[in-house]
């Protein structure tokens, strides 16, 4: 008996995220999921922020990228997960 | 240890503004955003809006859009929550909430560590 | 924006009871919730992430089950300091939202 993770109408098992965290599809707004060896990755859309891309930047705040966490390079996706 | 301490109790007009901080010690504070939470008295717990304390980008409930300003300083590690135009519905205790890694992690364990809280009363 | 209901709003139950509180959002969250135990005048306190896993230090006698719009928090066998206020937040989603509480009090 498998918990399972929902997201978009689709249940993924906890072996399938194993395998393939990006199964689960969780980065946001037009994110993209990249497996990582923590992990997984999103690469937010520019105006948005947040590990999974789920807030809007707000426009008068300072630049909608964040930066780099050790380890990545600026530009180089957030790691998720 | 990890700790949030917040400023003291503001009393204000309605109409005025008022700064609240939170200063963050015994981790990297560029590293984990950092959200406002909200309680008014005999309530329940209201999100307000989040700051990336590495870049300075924030988001805000569509609440607060407009009379809500968060920043952060790095060189003190502290963040802070403006709120403008208050009302006498704004009387509550306002709470800083460590959140996710800004780098991510395995897990999320956010809002994991809140600050003391601040009261902050409006009234004429 | 995504609406967290929880219940009961209040319930009471004595020491060493087992006591289930219910959260349901208005929309698919995944696994992405949290538990929150608020005392009067305190700090809410983190017990639960991740809908199911236990923050460090917290006793095992509560737990955290379900997955996409249902979801529970259990304690198995309540204690004095149990009683408390107990709050649902979802993080998948922008706002993130909170349920109304579920006040926990002495029969």
């Known amino acids: 008996d498998h918990h399972h993770h929902h997201h978009e109408q689709k249940l993924i098992s906890e072996e399938d995220l194993r395998a393939d965290p990006c199964a689960a599809r969780p980065c946001a707004h037009g994110g993209r999921c990249y497996a990582h060896f923590s992990g997984l990755v999103c690469a937010c859309a520019p105006g948005y922020m947040g590990a999974r891309c789920e807030f809007p930047v707000h426009p008068d705040g300072a630049s909608a990228l964040p930066a780099a966490p050790p380890g990545l390079r600026p530009g180089d996706p957030q790691r998720y997960l | 240890q990890v700790q949030l301490v917040q400023s003291g109790a503001e009393v204000k007009k309605p109409g005025a503004s008022v700064k609240v901080s939170c200063k963050a010690s015994?981790?990297?504070?560029?590293?984990?955003?950092m959200h406002w939470v909200r309680q008014a008295p005999g309530q329940g717990l209201e999100w307000m809006g989040i700051?990336?304390?590495?870049?300075?980008?924030?988001s805000y409930a569509q609440k607060f859009q407009g009379r809500v300003t968060m920043t952060r300083d790095t060189s003190t590690s502290t963040v802070y929550m403006e709120l403008s135009s208050l009302r006498s519905e704004d009387t509550a205790v306002y709470y800083c909430?460590?959140?996710?890694?800004?780098?991510?992690?395995?897990?999320?364990?956010?809002?994991?560590?809140w600050g003391q809280g601040t009261t902050v009363t409006v009234s004429s | 924006d995504i609406q967290m209901t929880q219940s009961p709003s209040a319930m009471s139950a004595s020491v060493g009871d087992r006591v289930t509180i219910t959260c349901r959002a208005s929309?698919?969250?995944?696994?992405?919730l949290a538990w929150f135990q608020q005392k009067p005048g305190k700090v809410p306190e983190p017990l639960i992430y991740?809908?199911?896993s236990l923050q460090s230090g917290v006793p095992s006698r509560f737990s955290g089950s379900g997955s996409v719009t249902e979801f529970t928090l259990t304690i198995s066998s309540l204690q004095p300091e149990d009683f408390a206020t107990y709050y649902c937040?979802?993080?998948?989603?922008?706002?993130?939202?909170f349920g109304q509480g579920t006040k926990l009090e002495i029969k």
């Open positions: 909430a460590r959140g996710e890694a800004v780098g991510g992690n395995y897990y999320y364990y956010g809002m994991d560590v």
């Open positions: 015994g981790y990297t504070f560029t590293s984990y955003y």
């Open positions: 700051i990336n304390p590495s870049g300075g980008s924030t």
């Open positions: 929309q698919g969250i995944s696994n992405y």
């Open positions: 991740a809908a199911s």
């Open positions: 937040l979802q993080h998948n989603s922008s706002p993130y939202t």
